[in-house]
């Protein structure tokens, strides 16, 4: 650091004063010197280091007519919005010829009310769940003693006696406010007041109660909600997608989930209008007057298979002697599962019914017993899944086949009144 020489008398006739104040204060340090001839540029030092970007102004007043006469030089350093980094020892420095002169020092100090570096933040917490809040303040002057308050009531018997920088709260059952007071020799500063909103705990034990091809009944155990009763629970379901990766609970599914609200109690809900034999993921959250709990993890569930909702379509049945040729098309109505095959039944007027499992084929040739003289032969067809048989078609009479004629086709039943399946579904 530059040092003043003692070889000549110092040109300084006014040295910087002292400034002590609170953060944000604006003040000015002033140096005055008297020199002969060309006035030098005045530099400012803080703790021995030249301030390159100082907010300083220099005023020069000649004391005579001649340039070689004496000049009064005044340099003023302006400190705006005093901060901790501004504190220290200040001096003026000038170069006169081959000599360096440094003024007597002035001191800038920061002293005021405590200043918060960290204050408690608003947050939500689940009822009866531990959490931490932070508060940090500094002077000068030090020390700074903290006192935490909950709902404006001190949490310790005196400042500095309780938790200081971090407050551990073992759990809340009602929405509460927290703040901290910072005490030092100059006074007290109070932090912002943080509102800690108590939400219901995440529900537990989400599980299936019963399954139907198009509906699932689910139940769960509600978490604690403090002094606030639960108003409702919300269930979300989404069609499972192997690429979704929601088994672990994250991330949220890409498509819009299907949402249903349940009045509580009971903590149970029947989800209807689902696709049969379809994997879903479901989750639940419960809400009080303070807001919703966090969601449970996604639970994989699956609707069971059902029986086909309609009979096979467009059945044609023709007879040629002792042979009958029957063919049909897959039911138009929802299969509610994986089609495993078809069953066919035929019967004459006075003969017992013959039942056959055709498998997945959609046509069959029947070898009729006797000479084929059995009268009023009719055929019925039903589709089946692992859950059982769907409805049988209306009986189709076996008609004699005449060469050159098209085979007769029978519309079996009136169009079944099946429910429309479209999203959203409740």
């Amino acid at each position: 650091a530059p040092r003043g020489t003692q070889a000549e008398e110092s040109p300084f006739v006014g040295n910087p004063g002292n400034i002590t104040g609170a953060r944000g204060l604006t003040g000015t340090l002033r140096c005055q010197l008297q020199v002969q001839g060309e006035p030098p540029e005045v530099h400012w030092l803080r703790d021995g280091q030249i301030l390159e970007l100082a907010d300083s102004t220099q005023t020069q007043v000649p004391l005579g007519e001649d340039e070689q006469d004496d000049w009064i030089v005044v340099s003023q350093l302006r400190i705006t919005s005093l901060q901790l980094s501004d504190t220290g020892q200040y001096q003026c420095l000038v170069f006169l010829g081959h000599q360096t002169f440094v003024s007597q020092p002035g001191y800038v100090g920061l002293e005021g009310l405590p200043y918060f570096l960290e204050e408690p933040e608003d947050r939500t917490v689940a009822a009866n769940t531990p959490f931490n809040l932070s508060c940090q303040a500094q002077g000068p002057p030090e020390p700074v003693d903290l006192l935490w308050l909950q709902d404006a009531v001190p949490l310790a018997t005196a400042p500095g006696h309780g938790p200081q920088r971090s407050l551990h709260v073992p759990g809340l059952n009602k929405t509460s406010s927290f703040s901290c007071e910072a005490h030092n020799a100059k006074g007290v500063t109070t932090s912002r007041t943080a509102t800690i909103t108590v939400l219901p705990q995440q529900p537990r034990n989400l599980h299936l109660v019963s399954r139907q091809p198009t509906e699932l009944e689910v139940a769960w155990t509600p978490g604690l909600s403090g002094i606030y009763p639960l108003t409702h629970c919300t269930l979300q379901a989404v069609l499972s997608d192997d690429g979704m990766g929601i088994q672990a609970g994250e991330p949220d599914p890409p498509e819009e989930p299907l949402t249903s609200q349940a009045s509580v109690p009971p903590h149970q809900l029947r989800l209807g209008s689902l696709h049969p034999h379809t994997p879903y993921h479901i989750r639940v959250a419960c809400t009080s007057s303070q807001g919703p709990s966090s969601w449970t993890h996604w639970l994989p569930v699956e609707t069971p298979e059902g029986v086909p909702l309609g009979p096979p379509e467009n059945i044609s049945a023709t007879r040629n002697g002792s042979q009958a040729f029957v063919h049909w098309q897959e039911p138009r109505a929802p299969l509610q599962g994986t089609l495993l095959g078809y069953r066919l039944a035929y019967q004459g007027q006075d003969t017992p019914e013959v039942l056959m499992d055709i498998g997945l084929r959609q046509e069959v040739t029947l070898e009729l017993q006797g000479d084929g003289s059995v009268s009023n032969l009719t055929v019925c067809v039903a589709a089946y899944t692992a859950a059982g048989d769907g409805p049988w078609s209306l009986p189709v009479p076996l008609e004699a086949w005449r060469p050159g004629e098209a085979q007769p086709v029978h519309q079996l039943v009136k169009e079944p009144s099946t429910p429309a399946f479209s999203w959203p579904w409740w």
Epitope: P143, A156, T157, G160, G187
Partner: antibody, heavy 113, light 107 residues
Framework: QVQLQESGPGLVKPSETLSLTCTVS????????WGWIRQPPGKGLEWIGY???????SYNPSLKSRVSISRDTSKNQFSLKLSSVTAADTAVYYC???????WGQGTLVTVSS | DIQMTQSPSSLSASVGDRVTITCRAS??????LRWYQQKPGKAPKLLIS???NLAAGVPSRFSGSGSGSDYTLTISSLQPEDFATYYC?????????FGQGTKVEIK
């Protein structure tokens, strides 16, 4: 530099009121809490009570019916009054900031006729 | 009131010794405990706050530990200036209560 200085009579007659004042320099009594502690000769420390920066008080229940702590913020002083004293109240009386970083040097008060 | 039981009431030790003083509260005081050193004719001096936090300017040979209702002040290597009386204080509840003191004397 923070300093606390107790002042008041060193001798009080039984049944009279003991009055002490603590003058604080270097620290505003409108911040923090300020208390009185006493120590009978050759014995341990006993907490008497405190006054908060806002002027509310807390007292040791064993003395509550006889004790009063007040303050004068314009003089940066707080005071202790203990009524109906007996010989058992003979002690060195200390004033302190309740964080106990800073104490007065203590003043011996003797209760005797 | 919370009772503070300090032990031992006195002990004799030599320079360089490790000294341990304990304080037991009649109920859980949740670390609201302070330790003081007092020399004859002087005001007490704060050593430890919050059961474990060393006060400014106190040598690191002093340390505090404990939780719940049991607390300990340890002087790792006793120095000549450490011969004094030591007090614990609970400030969890009003009235604040001191232990009866432990006098550390030169053996």
């Amino acid at each position: 530099q923070v300093q606390l200085q107790e002042s008041g009579p060193g001798l009080v007659k039984p049944s009279e009121t003991l009055s002490l004042t603590c003058t604080v320099s270097g620290y505003s009594i409108t911040s923090n809490y300020w208390g009185w502690i006493r120590q009978p000769p050759g014995k341990g420390l006993e907490w008497i009570g405190y006054i908060t920066y806002s002027g509310s008080t807390s007292y040791n229940p064993s003395l509550k019916s006889r004790v009063s702590i007040s303050r004068d913020t314009s003089k940066n002083q707080f005071s202790l009054k203990l009524s109906s004293v007996t010989a058992a109240d003979t002690a060195v009386y200390y004033c302190a900031i309740t964080t106990f970083y800073y104490w007065g040097q203590g003043t011996l008060v003797t209760v005797s006729s | 009131d919370i009772q503070m039981t300090q032990s031992p009431s006195s002990l004799s030790a030599s320079v360089g010794d490790r000294v341990t003083i304990t304080c037991r509260a009649s109920q859980d005081i949740g670390n609201y405990l302070r330790w003081y050193q007092q020399k004859p004719g002087k005001a007490p001096k704060l050593l430890i706050s919050g059961a474990t936090n060393l006060a400014a300017g106190v040598p690191s040979r002093f340390s505090g530990s404990g939780s719940g209702s049991d607390y300990t002040l340890t002087i790792s290597s006793l120095q000549p200036e450490d011969f004094a009386t030591y007090y614990c204080l609970q400030s969890k509840e009003s009235p604040w209560t001191f232990g009866q003191g432990t006098k550390v004397e030169i053996k």
